[in-house]
Amino acid sequence: TQNKALPENVKYGIVLDAGSSHTSLYIYKWPAEKENDTGVVHQVEECRVKGPGISKFVQKVNEIGIYLTDCMARATAVIPRSQHQETPVYLGATAGMRLLRMESEELADRVLDVVERSLSNYPFDFQGARIITGQEEGAYGWITINYLLGKFSQKTRWFSIVPYETNNQETFGALDLGGASTQVTFVPQNQTIESPDNALQFRLYGKDYNVYTHSFLCYGKDQALWQKLAKDIQVASNEILRDPCFHPGYKKVVNVSDLYKTPCTKRFEMTLPFQQFEIQGIGNYQQCHQSILELFNTSYCPYSQCAFNGIFLPPLQGDFGAFSAFYFVMKFLNLTSEKVSQEKVTEMMKKFCAQPWEEIKTSYAGVKEKYLSEYCFSGTYILSLLLQGYHFTADSWEHIHFIGKIQGSDAGWTLGYMLNLTNMIPAEQPLSTPLSHSTYV
């Protein structure tokens, strides 16, 4: 008779990231007997839901179940049936839903209600759907990348698990860019965090962390573009907007009603003598950069120093992982290499934005034109946000690491969120046998 392998004693968890532009489902797996060890949880699957973000279903809430079904069915196939009932499912919605809630709490609640009803139909242990705060989004992103980099482990390693990992236990800062918001989170060096709203205290694995975090709502790449268009159309002499952030020869008609649909453009709203206008690209990086800078109010700062819009930002400290759209955009532009200096990035952006639209379309035939057309803006926006918004310099640019995955797990807030909600980050350093802990993040 053959020796039968003992069943793996593993656990699974599912987190859905309901972002402004799309929803992704992540499946995590870990050995049951090592729950409190650092670095044991890893991602086994990402399923990107085909379609827009959940906030777009506000007029079609009854269809949210249809929208989620493929990825949820995928989860039922990936996770062994015997584990279904004990697998927790969490859905966290971010800035797209924060914006919808600003417009109508009732509509946001209706969307979440249908999401909850839909997810409750599956054989998992559904734990709820909620809009997470910007502070949570920043904090959980910071926990994720430092957990995956092994920064919370007390065992110093003589080897590096990822190319940009330093062997010291200094944590990485986290830079997250979404479609509707952006987060900056890091441990400042012996600096008091002057605004209580931006201060977090954690005790993780026996060590205290004083963390700075801020989420800038409306400063994700998609909402920043809407802001820029709303700002620029104010001073347009007619219904033609010559825009340096789009390639020469690019043309697109925009409905004014779409422009003013988002709360992010309210501050620029005015009565225009036309219902539509045409963007005509002129592809000039420097002018695009200048136009973007006008979105950052740097004239007012009630603290020792600020990022923009009067928000406190301590001096930058240490290395930073830049993920989500920071990574996707820079990856598309082929600018994620550690060897590319800030000056070189700027140089390459100048060349890219100046390329004629017809040429760009031919070079990237497989990419949807809407997304393709926005890379010039997005790349320029990333540079503007990091340099002028967050005060990175040509020197400190080298401390930014554009990262998609660490050890096979996506960088982002979802892993940190699950680790916290499943009580897998102990406040104290676990002994060799796992103990139960009552104090968690």
Epitope: H22, K50, G51, G65, T69, Y122
Partner: antibody, heavy 122, light 111 residues
């Protein structure tokens, strides 16, 4: 505008193999699923299977397993259907199609290729 | 496999009148609170076109005269008022379970 452009008609001998292509334009192939559907002259529709080009995951009708292999190439935004050990029963029009939500708005729409006519004959 | 039986096999309806096509599944196509039943239209020499998804939702750009209903095993497609351009083959399709299957089709003609 979303378009699926299929390769031209094929005349092949029994026992041979063929690879049909479906070039997608107007959207990123990774943002959708691609289905393959078979239709014999004056007959109904048969679902062969579906591929998720984002990760290569496939679902097949078991009766086409071993006969059909679906693949995709995200760099060229193209889906492929490879048919092997061809017999006269494989003579049909083969469609590639996508149906589902648009990636910007909550609009559910479908797009089909024009169909590739495969004739298996000696 | 889930077998879909369409009825009638052919149907002639006067312009402006209601056309009703039925589809019965050999087992329920409901799952997770959703009815995984779709309807397609096909005209000669053309690929099929999605009309209805998840039993009752209209595809993008589909005229309001097309509606779908039903749950479990019994579904129907209604066209009201019937127009000349609606003469075509109609297929029901289930996507609850692999293999996804189509009904045998209903030929709709103008009376």
């Amino acid at each position: 505008e979303v378009q699926l452009q299929q390769s031209g008609a094929e005349l092949v001998k029994p026992g041979a193999s063929v690879k049909l292509s479906c070039i997608v334009s107007g959207f990123n192939i990774k943002d959708t699923y691609i289905n393959w559907v078979k239709q014999r002259p004056e007959q109904g529709l048969e679902w062969i299977g579906r591929i998720d080009p984002a990760n290569g995951n496939t679902k097949y009708d078991p009766k086409f397993q071993g006969k059909a292999t679906m693949t995709s190439d995200t760099s060229s935004n193209t889906a492929y259907l490879h048919l092997s050990s061809l017999t006269s029963d494989d003579s049909a029009v083969y469609y590639c199609a996508r149906w589902g939500y648009d990636d910007e708005e909550a609009d559910y729409f479908d797009s089909w290729g024009q169909g590739t006519t495969l004739t298996v004959s000696s | 496999d889930i077998v879909l039986t369409q009825s009638p096999a052919s149907l002639a309806v006067s312009l402006g009148q209601r056309a009703t096509i039925s589809c019965r599944a050999s087992e329920s196509v409901d799952n997770y609170g959703i009815s995984f039943m779709n309807w397609f239209q096909q005209k000669p020499g053309q690929p099929p076109k999605l009309l209805i998804y998840a039993a009752s939702n209209q595809g993008s750009g589909v005229p309001a005269r097309f509606s779908g209903s039903g749950s479990g095993t019994d579904f129907s497609l209604n066209i009201l008022p019937m127009e000349e351009v609606d003469a075509a083959m109609y297929f029901c399709h289930q996507s609850k379970e692999v293999p996804w299957t189509f009904g045998g089709g209903t030929k709709l003609e103008i009376k």
